[in-house]
Interface confidence: medium
């Protein structure tokens, strides 16, 4: 610059920002700093209007900072950073083009303590890493947990026990077995658990007189065939002892048999009442069993007539049908069981017939809402008690009839009862009257042929003393009702002592044991009771299936309408607690005032009128 010339570079505004000013002899020039470029493209420039603009060095080449790096442009220069998973040699960023020019190298994260969870292996990869659970562990969230191989996989062979351990497992053979590999513990299915043949391994195990028997997991010592000593399980040598000859009958034969020991053998025989399953009388086969003989099925008449046969193991028990009892005279020897009809029923015979009656005998029955029913039952039983108290003492039919009247007279109480209670009580009352009439005929007090009349029942009974010709008949009447019995009945009924018949007619009983107790298959018919309830009985064994009929003439309570058809019904105790059924009787004739019934048995009867049979309502 000439002496006295101006130094333009002293003025800081001569050159733009980011430029350096250089003074020359006669002038100056501006140069953009490194990382900047003049707006007019000249390296050296003068004058206003030219700016130094930042150069984006990051765009000057594809990878200005090198591989695995990020270039960031900053004013006048560029900053280099390594990608995640990579690092410079200093671990820091650097300025592009500076002396500290680095390369980004992969970081081995596996060198960082605790980067992977416990019981996992760390694998480094370029720019990353991965954690893998060690064998025997499984990933659960972010931790490696023990895998229970015993549960998750089939890892041990048959006859082995699996034991899970932390990170592993082991197998042990079950007691008395050993692994094919010979070790106490093993892994996997390559080895198997095999039985140790202790007998082959040690021939002296059972001593000289015993036979060694190998079993799965153990062994036992046993005597040769035909000799015995209690078999025992052994750990060492057998106890001192000798094998002695066997009595084969010791626990050899099946249940319900006896054993006969023979020289060198034996045989079994079933006990009486049992038969061998192979049909042989004497047998040895261990598979044979002695089975009970069902004597009742084998012979339906095993116990005789009117009996019940019950099979029991090895035998059978005989009992009698209802209304029958064992005949002590005819039941002396085995197979001579005999049942004879009960002459007349007592309280004990009736109690068995109904659960409701049994309730009355227990105190609680009287407190369970059966009070009215039980009062009438007990009143009826009192009559029977008087009859049965002393079976050889004379029975007063008059006093019994009076007592029955007292029960019948409690009509209001009867109507409080349920249907079942009514039919049960009706049955008891009818059977009590029959028993009392029979007792009066069998053990008469004075004249056994008598007529009793009370407000509620009339009875006529006759003892047939004089010779009664077979073609003749006996007539009995009570109120307006009659019973005609042929003399044949004397022979057929098999009476002990003088034969007798009795007939009873009940007043008002038809209103209690009414048509609702008739099981009618034709629901469209209208039914009504139209006679008193009557009953006939005869002394002796037989009460039914007579060769000739018994004729009952029953008086209608109201005249029979033309549209009505009478049904002769008898009281049947086999149906529920007692029901009217039409079986066993048929109508001989019916007038406006009477119906004549012909029946093959002694029974309690009544007439039910049915109307509207042809008209469907």
């Amino acid at each position: 610059q000439t002496l006295g010339g101006v130094n333009e570079c002293q003025d800081t505004t001569t050159c733009p920002a980011y430029a350096t000013c250089t003074d020359t002899t006669d002038s100056y020039y501006c140069t953009c700093k490194r990382g900047f470029l003049s707006s007019n493209g000249q390296t050296n420039f003068q004058g206003p209007g030219v700016e130094c603009q930042d150069v984006n060095e990051c765009l000057q080449s594809d990878s200005p900072c090198g591989p695995n790096s990020v270039c960031t442009n900053i004013l006048g220069r560029a900053k280099c950073s390594c990608l995640r998973g990579f690092s410079s040699s200093t671990g820091k960023d650097w300025i592009l083009g500076s002396l500290d020019n680095f390369l980004c190298a992969d970081v081995d994260e596996c060198l960082t303590i605790g980067i992977c969870p416990k019981y996992s292996n760390c694998s480094n990869s370029v720019g990353s890493y991965s954690c893998t659970c060690q064998p025997g562990f499984v990933l659960n969230g972010s931790i490696c947990e023990d895998e229970d191989e015993c549960v998750t996989r089939d890892v041990c062979p048959e006859h082995a026990t699996c034991h899970n351990t932390l990170g592993s497992y082991y197998c042990t053979c079950n007691s008395g077995l050993e692994s094919s590999g010979g070790g106490p513990m093993f892994q996997g299915l390559d080895e198997s658990c095999e039985d140790v043949d202790e007998c082959s391994r040690n021939s002296t195990l059972c001593g000289p007189t015993f036979i060694c028997i190998n079993t799965l997991g153990s062994y036992s010592c046993s005597c040769p065939a035909g000799f015995s000593l209690p078999t025992f399980q052994i750990l060492g040598h057998p106890a001192d002892g000798n094998c002695t000859d066997i009595d084969e009958c010791d626990d050899t034969c099946p249940l319900n048999s006896s054993c006969t020991n023979t020289i060198g053998s034996y045989f079994c025989t079933c006990h009486p009442g049992f038969a061998s399953s192979n049909g042989q009388l004497n047998f040895k086969d261990l598979e044979v069993t002695c089975e009970d003989i069902d004597e009742c099925t084998q012979d339906p008449l095993q116990c005789g007539l009117n009996s019940v046969c019950t099979n029991v193991p090895g035998s059978y028990i005989c009992g009698c049908l209802p209304d029958f009892q064992m005949d002590p005279e005819g039941s002396q020897g085995y197979g001579n069981f005999n049942c004879k009809r009960i002459l007349f029923k007592c309280k004990e015979d009736l109690i068995l017939q109904s659960e409701q009656i049994q309730q009355c005998q227990a105190v609680q029955g009287r407190d369970l809402g059966y009070a009215s029913f039980c009062t009438l039952v007990n009143a009826t039983f009192t009559i029977l008690d008087n009859t049965c108290e002393n079976k050889s003492a004379p029975v007063s039919l008059q006093s019994a009839a009076t007592s029955v009247s007292l029960v019948l007279e409690q009509a209001t109480t009867w109507f409080e009862l349920s249907k079942e209670e009514t039919s049960t009580l009706g049955t008891i009352l009818l059977e009590t009257v029959e028993s009392t009439m029979l007792a009066a005929l069998l053990i008469p007090s004075g004249n056994a042929s008598q007529m009793i009349q009370t407000e509620y029942l009339d009875i006529e009974s006759k003892v047939i003393n004089e010779e009664c010709k077979e073609n003749e008949s006996i007539n009995l009447a009570a109120r307006g009702d009659k019973m005609n019995v042929g003399c044949f009945i004397i022979k057929e009924s098999v009476s002990t002592g003088a034969p007798g018949v009795a007939f009873v007619s009940f007043a008002h009983m038809e209103s209690v044991l009414n048509e609702r107790f008739f099981e009618d298959g034709q629901s469209f018919r209208k039914l009504r009771m139209n006679s008193r309830v009557v009953g006939g009985t005869v002394t002796g064994e037989k009460k039914e299936d007579f060769s000739k009929p018994i004729i009952y003439t029953l008086q209608h309570i109201q005249p029979k309408q033309k549209s009505e058809r009478p049904i002769c019904v008898s009281w049947n105790t086999d149906v529920e607690d007692g029901r009217w059924t039409p079986s066993g009787c048929e109508i001989v004739e019916a007038s406006e005032t009477h119906t004549v019934c012909s029946c093959n048995r002694m029974a309690n009867l009544a007439i039910i009128m049915a109307s509207g049979e042809l008209t469907m309502e």
Partner: antibody, heavy 117, light 107 residues
């Protein structure tokens, strides 16, 4: 901090049952909960453990049928019911948080159970 | 089941001394053994797991060693608060089993 709070002492009659509780706090209720019996004669005996997340249980065979382990995740509480109690069941019962590697990093204070006629 | 035999049954020592407690397993349990401290009125405390790993918050004077069947708990320079009952426990397989305990008493 991790805390295990156990129910109070119990005096019960032979033949009856008792249900002990263990309330966990201070951590996420996911770790196995173990139960341990301590008697003077037998020392410490591991009864079994339950996984609160799944309800899965593992029992010591000596306590199968005697102890029943359950959890209520909503209240972070573990329960152990002991049935058909006899005087031999008289002991202190601890609940203990299980690490996934089967050791116990936190214990409850214990519940004394006395079985007496 | 793995039987754990602990010895000695009783141990008497003075503060400042070093003591060792042994635990023997009836079969190999690898490194999976834990040690616990039991003191009256306090919750049981885990000291060591996996044979030698110190539980966080436990002073470094406690150390564990051993693997397979034989293990040792060593307490260097005993402090007054170290006295109490010590139990070992195998955490290698179910059922988890404990040693019979060692009572460490102050002389």
């Amino acid at each position: 901090q991790v805390q295990l709070q156990q129910s109070g002492a119990e005096l019960v009659k032979p033949g009856t049952s008792v249900k002990l509780s263990c309330k966990a706090s201070g951590y996420t209720f996911t770790n196995h909960m173990n139960w341990v019996k301590q008697t003077t004669g037998q020392g410490l005996e591991w009864i079994g453990r339950i996984n609160p997340g799944t309800g899965g249980t593992s029992y010591n065979v000596n306590f199968k049928g005697k102890a029943t382990l359950t959890v209520d995740e909503s209240s972070s509480t573990a329960f152990m019911q002991l049935s058909s109690l006899t005087p031999e069941d008289s002991a202190v019962y601890y609940c203990a948080r299980g690490d996934s590697y089967w050791y116990f990093d936190f214990w409850g204070p214990g519940t004394m159970v006395t079985v007496s006629g | 089941d793995v039987q754990m035999t602990q010895s000695p049954y009783n141990l008497v020592a003075s503060p400042g001394e070093s003591v060792s407690i042994n635990c023997k397993a009836s079969k190999s349990i690898s490194k999976y053994l834990a040690w616990y401290q039991q003191k009256p009125g306090k919750a049981n405390k885990l000291l060591i797991y996996e044979g030698s790993t110190l539980q966080s918050g436990i002073p470094s004077r406690f150390s564990g060693s051993g693997s397979g069947t034989d293990f040792t708990l060593t307490i260097r320079s005993l402090e007054p608060e170290d006295f109490g009952l010590y139990y070992c426990q195998q955490h290698n397989e179910y059922p988890l089993t404990f040693g019979s305990g060692t009572k460490l008493e102050i002389k």
